[in-house]
Amino acid sequence: IWELKKDVYVVELDWYPDAPGEMVVLTCDTPEEDGITWTLDQSSEVLGSGKTLTIQVKEFGDAGQYTCHKGGEVLSHSLLLLHKKEDGIWSTDILKDQKEPKNKTFLRCEAKNYSGRFTCWWLTTISTDLTFSVKSSRGSSDPQGVTCGAATLSAERVRGDNKEYEYSVECQEDSACPAAEESLPIEVMVDAVHKLKYENYTSSFFIRDIIKPDPPKNLQLKPLKNSRQVEVSWEYPDTWSTPHSYFSLTFCVQVQGKSKREKKDRVFTDKTSATVICRKNASISVRAQDRYYSSSWSEWASVPCS
Amino acid sequence: RAVPGGSSPAWTQCQQLSQKLCTLAWSAHPLVGHMDLREEGDEETTNDVPHIQCGDGCDPQGLRDNSQFCLQRIHQGLIFYEKLLGSDIFTGEPSLLPDSPVGQLHASLLGLSQLLQPEGHHWETQQIPSLSPSQPWQRLLLRFKILRSLQAFVAVAARVFAHGAATLSP
């Protein structure tokens, strides 16, 4: 058993049929010695008396809010949560496996630049009685500070008869060094509590591996005289690291016909313009990627040819 | 060429060669479905690798103030990786494919390090750790880790030379 926060404790249980459970001793936080009784949740049934209560925690029915009273007055509370371990593996019931980029990916994170700011998100089908708490650091043995905000519900999607909820959190490395080569990964730890179930999820990454630039901005077409060619120009996204002579992007320009089956013409360039042939009803799209490190491409920025 | 003592390197040549290094490093070890090599216990393998750290002056301001600190750090790293790529980690079993970019990568590391340090001038170089994995699968894993680490290193080096070529070239 360990303390998650004040008066909230996590009991770690091996979860299998007829498991013996864990013996837990609760102590009433009071100078009083006599006349103390214990109850669980809203029940008025007295579980025991005395300053301490010894219980065997085996299942969710044994978890909950234990309260010690004296003469009708509440003295203190202890909330017991369960953390299940099945076949040596901690349960992951609360969050959905996003399966991208690999199986057992519960947390996904992205950064728009090298400033040390990043966003992580996760999915669940649980809509109520759910809380998240996020901590992060650079490295684990001698951790350096990363400050995370509160997790918020960022999207709600319908999947068949069920809804899926996306939560996200923004974090910022306290002393980020955008130009340095990272040697210690960022660690992100999410505590999830649903009712009386506790779970924790972790992700470890280098900022360089989660970079995904915003799409190029101000995408414009300039027809070239007496030609089907156009000059496409764009700019670096505002959110990208500066100076651009140091933090450079490379670009992919694509000409795509109306039909998805039509052949796509693609050009790769380090410049912020390109000359392409504009076909009728086609659209021109540009996306960006770090020039020197193959992290994710941005989403496409698009304009119609006409 | 960078003469230790203060003169500028051939920024544009260094830029071109470092960008080529980036391309080669990624073609030698493309990102295979985000193969997470950190899970395999990095400590003993990549802790000794020279990293370009915050105080090494490789940021735009540090380069403007005095690029020599940064260039020395990059040179150290290039020599380190050049020696690793020439070691039995890469020459031993399992053999690399004949068309593997590792050979080109090795040669380009050497080329860039020579651009930074002409013959007769010596910056101190870092000791190469004695990594001699016994099993072929360990060697394979170590190759992946070294290449992943090299990708990060050459990306910073390429940024340095690109910025230098754009802002510090005479």
């Epitope: 949740d41 809203q42 969710f60 029915g61 809509s127 009685d129 009386l196 | -």
Partner: antibody, heavy 117, light 108 residues
Framework: QSVEESGGRLVTPGTPLTLTCAVS????????MIWVRQAPGEGLEWIGI?????NTYYASWVKGRFTISKTSTTVDLKMISPTTEDTATYFC??????????????WGPGTLVTVSS | FELTQTPSSVEAAVEGTVTIKCQAS??????LSWYQQKPGQPPKLLIY???KLAPGVPSRFSGSGSGTQFTLTIGDLECADAATYYC???????????FGGGTEVVVV
């Protein structure tokens, strides 16, 4: 502590109807409330809940046919455009107070809604 | 999400024992309650958290199970126990909520 439904009557299809659940002996700011219905001879079917903070959650089949709202002492169920399939006894119940998704330990007697032309 | 109750109807003698099963289509931990309903009356809470007896409910009623399989057992049957019994999952309103189809208990 009690709850009581009212407003059930005979209505023609398409005529909106609002059922009211009046509570006494407790505050709605501490409990989830649920609306459940039971067609003649059938089982219990939950319609939706309103949490202590006023958030509403509906069963997937509801699809905008009902809305739940509350005041300080009442919980309303609005039937937007009833059909004959909505003929049932409608129950309002109070949660235990432990959770939003809760079990229900205080039930009203129910109010009968008949939808017929 | 589905809660399947079996049997739909059961007949038992006074002083006998009845077992009703409730199966969830996914794990709902122990977030299951049982209700008793008599004709013309609202449901009455018997059991919550799969096995906890509601106040005032005789100890002849007991609940067990967790995950997806749950059981309500009524021992020492009385005529007054003739009713329809419903299980209810309250895991989450989106990810596992609702009532089972009901089991009619006939006492002979």
């Amino acid at each position: 502590q009690s709850v009581e439904e009212s407003g059930g009557r005979l209505v023609t299809p398409g005529t909106p109807l609002t059922l009211t659940c009046a509570v006494s002996g407790f505050s709605l700011s501490g409990y989830t409330m649920i609306w459940v219905r039971q067609a003649p001879g059938e089982g219990l079917e939950w319609i939706g809940i309103i949490s202590s903070s006023g958030n509403t959650y509906y069963a997937s089949w509801v699809k905008g046919r009902f809305t739940i709202s509350k005041t300080s002492t009442t919980v309303d169920l609005k039937m937007i455009s009833p059909t004959t399939e909505d003929t049932a006894t409608y129950f309002c119940a109070r949660g235990s107070g432990a959770y939003i998704s809760d079990y229900f330990n205080v039930w009203g007697p129910g109010t009968l809604v008949t939808v017929s032309s | 999400f589905e809660l399947t109750q079996t049997p739909s109807s059961v007949e038992a003698a006074v002083e006998g024992t009845v077992t009703i099963k409730c199966q969830a289509s996914q794990s709902i931990d122990s977030w299951l309650s049982w209700y008793q309903q008599k004709p013309g009356q609202p449901p009455k809470l018997l059991i919550y958290s799969a096995s906890k007896l509601a106040p005032g409910v005789p100890s002849r009623f007991s609940g067990s199970g967790s995950g997806t399989q749950f059981t309500l057992t009524i021992g020492d049957l009385e005529c007054a126990d003739a009713a329809t019994y419903y299980c209810q999952s309250y895991y989450d309103v989106n990810a596992g909520y609702g009532f089972g189809g009901g089991t009619e208990v006939v006492v002979v």
